[in-house]
Structure formats: C-alpha cells, structure tokens
C-alpha cells in the first residue's frame, strides 16, 4: 500500500516535558510536538509507535507528510486536524495501525492540500458517511484526495454495527460526490462479500482499484464501464468462480487496464467457456498463464489457458425425484 515518504533525514526530536505548554497556541515555525520527530527540510513529521491517544495540537505549519502510525487514537473527531493557521501544506497523512474504531464527520476538514490518506489496519466499526466529504449536503465541495488507502479496516465480527460493513464504507466514499477526483482506492483485506453496484459509477477518475484479499464471489452486478481510465484492477485472493460475458466485455473495453486475478477458486465447468476464450485472446490480464481451476475436483490445478470446450462440461441437472440429499 502507498504511504507518505520523507526525503530528508535531519529530524529534530522534542523533549516530552514540552508536551502541552503551548498546545493551545499557534505552533512556532520550528516547533515539534512531544513524542514526534520533525524535519522541516523534508516537511515531514513522524509520531510513530508512541501510543498517542489524540492528534497533537501543536503540529508545525510546514508539515507536508504526517505519519501518525502505531498509536492508540481510538476516535478521530470532527476537525481533528483543524488548526489556526490551517495545515495548508499537509498533502500526505498516514494513520495506519492506530487503533481507530471511529472516524467522525468532518474529521479531515480544513486540510486543503490533502491528497494521500492512509487509514489501513484500523478496526473501523464506525466510519461516518461524511468522514471524507465533511458535510451532509447532497453535493459537497470536492475533496482534494487523490489516494485513499483503506486496507484491512474491517473490525472484528463482534464489534461491527448492525449494518453492512460494505455499505458503511461505500456510503463514506459516495457522500456528497466529494471524491470525484480520487485516482487510487485500496480496499484490500476487508472481508467484502460483494461490491455495491453504485460505487464505481460515482468514482469516474479512478486509475487504480485494489480489492484483493476479500471474499468477492461474483462481479455480475458490478459495472466498470464508467471507469474509463482505470489502469489496475486488483482482484487477487478473492472467491471468484467465473467472470461472465458482460464483465469480460466491459474490461476489454477499457484501453488502459491491467487486471490481476491470481488465487481465485475458478470453477471450470460449462460456465467457464467464455472466460477461457477471452483469456486466450486478451492482453489485459497480468500472469494469465498462472490461473488454475479449483473445482470440480477432476479439474483441480488445470491451467485455464490450456482448457478447451470439451473440458468444460456441466453435469446434467437431475429432476427432483432423482436427486439425493
């Protein structure tokens, strides 16, 4: 997954006893929050693995790359990064692995340059629909976000609200149409069983979509048609059994796409014939020669590209009276 990177190494570390003396005041130009390391040359602040329970209030105004990883933030309230003067330069924000379970509406407001946001590896039981849009208007001001990294944000089963996790995430992605400029979206390792059908149509600028290591069984109701400039579609390590004609045609119609399909339990029966034909002709699938059948048992480990129509049969459906349980 992507994350902000720093290009210089001259970090200054502040002493813990300076912690809150000036936290309510505007930060001095060279000030570094307690428990953080700062490099003005690299415009980078790192507050990493420090068990912080809230976002430091005295972040330096120059910060462009902010790492707040490996902390214990729990809740990201509205305006968590709102400062006077604002953090106008902040472009890349990494909050991964900080035990966030709630991100509230407007958490990222007043960050006019925020292009990269990584919330991965947080058990987000409560992601507000307005976490990224900042308001509940039907059309919000466009978010500056270009990359949104949400890998492994699924909470444990017992901590989920009584609603679809997929639905909660999608609501946040679509609210106010704020993310129309999003180019990279990573949603890997989230136990997604399905992809809500409206999500992709409303993210027309997507270039990279990572849905790997989920539990997607089918793409039948998903349309990629609006993603005219999609460049990578990662579907590795899901539960896909077959891709049907409609999906194949849509993917083939995207001139810049590369599709990644490794490690899915492909079912090599009569329904697989169209996909096999397509695989033999297409150039869009990366490593297509590695795709193998998982079912039925007699076809296990057969290479899809080596199959022909005679290999792909379906057992006749028995009338109910002849079926055994």
């Amino acid at each position: 997954s992507s994350s902000p990177t720093s290009s210089a190494s001259s970090f200054s570390s502040s002493a813990p006893f300076l912690a809150s003396a000036v936290s309510a005041q505007p930060p001095l130009p060279d000030q570094c929050p307690a428990l953080c390391e700062c490099s003005e040359a690299a415009r980078t602040v790192k507050c990493v693995n420090r068990n912080l329970t809230e976002v430091p209030t005295d972040l330096p105004a120059y910060v462009r790359n902010l790492f707040l990883t490996g902390n214990q933030l729990a809740v990201l309230p509205a305006g968590a990064f709102a400062r006077r003067p604002p953090l106008a330069e902040l472009a890349a924000l990494n909050l991964s692995g900080s035990r966030l379970d709630e991100v509230r509406a407007g958490a990222f407001e007043h960050l006019p340059s925020l292009r990269q946001l990584d919330l991965s590896h947080n058990p987000l039981a409560d992601l507000s629909p307005f976490a990224f849009s900042g308001s509940n208007a039907s059309v919000s001001a466009p978010s500056p976000l270009v990359e949104l990294i949400l890998n492994h944000i699924v909470p444990p089963e017992d901590e989920r609200q009584n609603r679809s996790f997929e639905g909660m995430v999608v609501a946040a992605l679509l609210a106010g149409r704020a993310l129309q400029g999003l180019r990279r979206l990573e949603l890997a390792s989230n136990h997604f069983l399905y992809l809500p059908r409206d999500v992709l149509a409303q993210l027309p600028s997507l270039r990279h979509l990572d849905l790997s290591n989920n539990s997607l069984v089918s793409l039948t109701y998903v349309s990629f048609r609006n993603l005219t400039h999609l460049e990578s579609l990662h579907l590795e390590d899901n539960a896909l059994k077959v891709l049907h004609n409609g999906t194949l045609a849509e993917l083939q119609g995207l001139p810049h796409i590369r599709v990644f399909l490794d490690n899915n339990p492909w079912v090599c029966d009569c329904h697989m014939a169209d996909m096999v034909t397509w695989l033999k002709e297409t150039e869009v699938v990366q490593g297509k020669d590695r795709l193998t059948c998982a079912y039925p048992e007699k076809m296990r480990n057969r290479v899809l590209l080596e199959l022909n129509s005679a290999d792909l049969d379906c057992d006749p459906i028995l009338p109910p009276s002849l079926q055994t349980s």
Epitope: Q116, E231, P255, G287
Partner: antibody, heavy 115, light 107 residues
Framework: QVQLVQSGAEVKKPGASVKVSCKAS????????MNWVRQAPGQGLEWMGR????????NYNGKFKGRVTMTADKSITTAYMELSRLRSDDTAVYYC????????WGQGTLVTVSS | DIQMTQSPSSLSASVGDRVTITCRAS??????LNWYQQKPGKAPKLLIY???RLHSGVPSRFSGSGSGTDYTFTISSLQPEDIATYFC?????????FGGGTKVEIK
C-alpha cells in the same frame, strides 16, 4: 505534480542504437503507463509504444516492432526506450509521456542520425 | 490502424474569437479522444481527455465534444497565449494515433 526528466541529446550513425531514459518524480500520483512518442522535425506526433511499469507489459506500434524495446526500473522510477538499426528518418525529438491519456510529458530528447 | 483526420491544418483568428477544430476518426473510437497543445520548441500538453474532460489546471475556455467518429475542440475566446499547434489523438484502439495538427495564429 508529475515531472518527467529525459536524458540529453544524442548523435548516432545509421545502423547504431540509441537508448533514451525518462525519470519520473512526484511519483505518488503518476500513472503506471509510460508512453513514448516521437516528432520528426516540422512534423506531427507518432506514438511508438508504452510500458506498464508495474509488470513490464508492453504494447508497441507495429511500425517499430523488432526495433524498439521499452523497459522500466521501478526502483529508480525510470523508463527507457531503445531504438536499434537507426536510419536517417529516425531523426526526431523523442518524448516520454506518463498516463493512459498522456497527462504529463518529458522535455524531449533530440536524436540525430547522420553519417 | 485508425486514421485521424484533423481540420483545418491552420487557421488565423482574432483575440476574443471563438475557434473550432474538428477531428474525424476512420472508425468509432467510443469517446477516447484527447486534445493536446504544443508551442514551438516545447513538449505537448494535455488539455482535454475522453472527449470533454478538462485536464487539471487547464482554463475553462477550452472544451471538447463529440461521439462516434466526429469530435470538436473549441476555444471560446482566443487569447494571445493560445497561439500553438493543437493535436487530437485516439486511445481507444492500439496503436494510438494522432491527427496531423492545426496551427492557430493571431490575425
């Protein structure tokens, strides 16, 4: 903003090869596709091919098949275009262009083929 | 290969004029049509992609329209800095191909 910086001008003899480099910065938001386009003096633009930098997959214009090789080194965010068996009509400015729709272009590299 | 026919090859207009350039593809290109601006001695710059989408930072006086095989590029009010050559390009079917260019001058 994505920036592409190309290697300097080259003078080559017919039959020789040339290798042009293109270094990308502002990389976080750049595309995986790097295209190569050339422009002969006073002429239009001609697409030569493209490389998908993540896995090295290439598409070449049939006109250059067998003479052009595109490679990429992810570790240094640099793409390369090598054209072999040069002829005088290969004299042109060679551009790298990042993106499916060629969103960002390098400054160009003039390759002169002359005996 | 898909042929892209651009017209006119050159035009002269006054500052403030509306300028229109057309591009015709030899077959349907499903809106995968881009427009570039090139000034002398410089690299081309993307202005419009996918027929009508404005590339970031491009002034709103530039626009595009069309479908199927016929596409149009418009400068709503020509400015002195718009003096350049404009190219169309299709990225629907490999190999990508360009139009021959339209040189825009000030009267």
């Amino acid at each position: 903003q994505v920036q592409l910086v190309q290697s300097g001008a080259e003078v080559k003899k017919p039959g020789a090869s040339v290798k042009v480099s293109c270094k990308a910065s502002g990389y976080a938001f750049s595309s995986s596709w790097m295209n190569w386009v050339r422009q002969a003096p006073g002429q239009g633009l001609e697409w030569m091919g493209r490389i998908y930098r993540e896995d090295g997959h290439t598409n070449y214009n049939g006109k250059f098949k067998g003479r052009v090789t595109m490679t990429a080194d992810k570790s240094i965010t640099t793409a390369y275009m090598e054209l072999s068996r040069l002829r005088s009509d290969d004299t042109a400015v060679y551009y790298c262009a990042n993106g499916g729709a060629m969103d960002y272009w390098g400054q160009g590299t003039l390759v002169t083929v002359s005996s | 290969d898909i042929q892209m026919t651009q017209s006119p090859s050159s035009l002269s207009a006054s500052v403030g004029d509306r300028v229109t350039i057309t591009c015709r593809a030899s077959q349907d290109i499903s809106n995968y049509l881009n427009w570039y601006q090139q000034k002398p001695g410089k690299a081309p710059k993307l202005l419009i992609y996918y027929t009508s989408r404005l590339h970031s930072g491009v002034p709103s006086r530039f626009s595009g329209s069309g479908s199927g095989t016929d596409y149009t590029f418009t400068i709503s009010s020509l400015q002195p800095e718009d003096i350049a050559t404009y190219f169309c390009q299709q990225d629907n079917t490999l190999p990508w191909t360009f139009g021959g260019g339209t040189k825009v001058e000030i009267k």
